[in-house]
């Protein structure tokens, strides 16, 4: 890597760089080359990015051989484009205001990352992108002719926004039940949710129910037969009980569970109903909760993070089970 | 970042009204409601009315009479009034923001004497 | 009159898995009553942990849930860590009105 050897180019062409990055001679004054850029490595044939004031820092003891693109003070930044000065402040969007700083840009968000929680006002909060705003705003998914102040979150029906199924209306009210969202947990159990006005008042509620995509401690990738990446809906081999907080299932289970891949896919509940299971406390207390039983699985690419209530409440629906009367078929 | 600052005066004679202000930054109170809460010395916490995102409002029963909650969009600011105050209003009063209550301000003393 | 009660304290051990409970004077809680968690930690602000019965607040770590247990809202703590140690409150709505619980305070020992 050092200047004593002849001069040998890679190549007789000059390379192609990405947008943003110079081409330079090496320091040995031999070859063209892309320029390395702030925080990746150099050396001596392989130098910093110049015009971006950028030189190779070889730390001390200054006689090794490898060092890290390095600003010097007061370097500029090329960001999206343009050339900005160490200080000068800019918005790279309506989203996210930015500052260069010695040759390294860093930016803030100018829209709130906020996040909000259920409450009478707002059973049911979703972010949406709104025409003409640039930051999404929080909507609350209530019935448009909901009492214009108070959180009485009557679904009565005063205009034909919906086009109901005339078998769902009940004493004016329009019966409206979410699908069941995913479950807060990817092993485990866990809690699925939704939301529903079919109740004597006709009043929004939140519904929730047990769910168990996969136990914790089943080690599913070692059942995946050979030359195949997924094993959908592994066969349990054995009833089993459930436990909740101490408590623990009257009766077993032979339940169904969903797999897993080994190419990136994640598989996820498809088809469920629900059904009530009772737990038996160690005071003695008997407590009943409706939990999800798992029809069939898929596995797909569409996975969000793992166990996050918000992303999964809005992201990764569950079909079947939309029953308004009666929980489970 | 998110803000609840309750404002008022210290001490309020009896059979006098308490008003408190509570300014908000970092999000809109037409989008959040916003609930007064109070706790008194060594005391558990009293839930005594929230003013709606839309501007409707909803009371602690045993204080309907003599409460007034109120807002101001434009400020961004939730007023807070109760009259007829006795010493058992002596309290440290909160504004905290509806949705789980997750934001709270960090309360102001309220002290009902002559 | 309605009262929300809570269990006046609880001590665990950390790492351990504590459940605190929230009864309603009027019968069983369900999702309607949009069960909230507020915390105090001594010498700091109230701060909401859990919101409509189940949602974790961005601030809450995964150890805590909520959830309804028996016709109570619960809130279950595993792997409790010292930090944990503050004074924990429950509030139901019902239909125009909250009533806070006379709060839980949570002892970690150690």
């Known amino acids: 890597q050092d200047c004593s050897a002849q001069c040998q180019c890679a190549a007789e062409a000059a390379p192609h760089c990405p947008a943003g990055v110079s081409l330079v001679l090496d320091g040995c004054g031999c070859c063209r080359v892309c320029a390395k850029q702030l925080g990746e490595l150099c050396t001596e044939r392989d130098p910093c990015d110049p015009h971006k004031g950028l030189f190779c820092d070889f730390g001390s003891p200054a006689n090794r051989k490898i060092g890290v693109c390095t600003a010097k003070d007061g370097a500029p930044c090329v960001f999206g484009g343009s050339v900005y000065r160490s200080g000068e402040s800019f918005q790279s969007s309506c989203k996210y205001q930015c500052t260069c700083l010695d040759g390294a840009v860093g930016c803030v968000p100018l829209c709130s990352m906020d996040v909000r929680l259920p409450s009478p006002d707002c059973p049911f909060p979703r972010r949406v992108k709104l025409p003409g705003k640039c930051c999404e705003e929080w909507v609350c998914d209530e019935p448009k002719d909901r009492t214009a102040v108070g959180p009485a979150l009557a679904a009565y029906r005063l205009e034909d926004t919906f086009g109901p199924d005339p078998t769902m209306m009940r004493a004016n009210c329009l019966v409206q039940t979410t699908e069941w969202s995913a479950c807060s947990k990817t092993c485990g159990m866990g809690i699925s949710t939704r939301v529903t006005n079919d109740n004597t008042f006709c009043r929004l509620e939140k519904q929730s129910r047990l769910c168990m995509v996969r136990p914790c401690e089943a080690d599913l990738e070692e059942n995946i037969k050979k030359g195949k990446k997924c094993i959908r809906t592994p066969k349990i081999a054995k009833p089993v009980k459930f436990e909740l907080s101490g408590c623990t299932s009257v009766k077993t289970y032979r339940a169904k569970f969903c797999g897993v891949c080994t190419d990136g896919r994640c598989c996820t509940p498809h088809r469920t109903t629900t059904l009530p299971v009772e737990f038996k406390c160690p005071d003695g207390e008997i407590m009943k909760k409706n939990m999800m039983f798992i029809k069939t699985c898929a596995c797909h690419y569409n996975c969000p993070g793992d166990n996050d209530i918000f992303e999964s409440l809005y992201y990764r629906k569950m079909y079947g089970d939309m029953a308004h009367h009666h929980h489970h078929h | 970042e998110v803000q609840l600052q309750e404002s008022g005066p210290g001490l309020v004679k009896p059979s006098q009204t308490l008003s408190l202000t509570c300014t908000v930054s970092?999000?809109?109170?037409?989008?959040?409601?916003v609930h007064w809460i109070r706790q008194h010395p060594g005391k558990g916490l009293e839930w005594l009315g929230v003013?709606?995102?839309?501007?409707?409002?909803d009371y602690n029963a045993a204080f309907m009479s003599r409460l007034t909650i109120s807002k101001d969009t434009s400020k961004n600011q939730v007023s807070f009034k109760l009259s007829s105050v006795t010493a058992a209003d002596t309290a440290v009063y909160y504004c905290?923001?509806?949705?789980?209550?997750?934001?709270w301000g960090q309360g102001t003393t309220v002290t009902v004497s002559s | 009159e309605t009262v929300v009660t809570q269990e006046p304290s609880l001590t665990v051990s950390p790492g351990g898995t504590v459940t605190l409970t929230c009864r309603s004077s009027?019968?069983?809680?369900?999702?309607?009553?949009?069960a909230n968690w507020v915390q105090q930690k001594p010498g700091q602000a109230f701060r909401g942990l859990i919101g409509g019965t189940s949602n974790r607040a961005p601030w809450t770590p995964a150890r805590f849930s909520g959830s309804l247990l028996g016709g109570k809202a619960a809130l279950t703590l595993s792997g409790v860590q010292p930090e944990d140690e503050a004074e924990y409150y429950c509030a139901l709505w019902y239909s125009t009105h909250y009533v806070f619980g006379g709060g839980t305070k949570l002892t970690v020992l150690g």
């Open positions: 009027i019968g069983a809680v369900t999702t309607s009553n949009y």
């Open positions: 905290a923001r509806d949705g789980g209550f997750d934001y």
């Open positions: 970092g999000f809109s109170i037409s989008t959040f409601g």
């Open positions: 003013i709606w995102r839309r501007g409707g409002t």
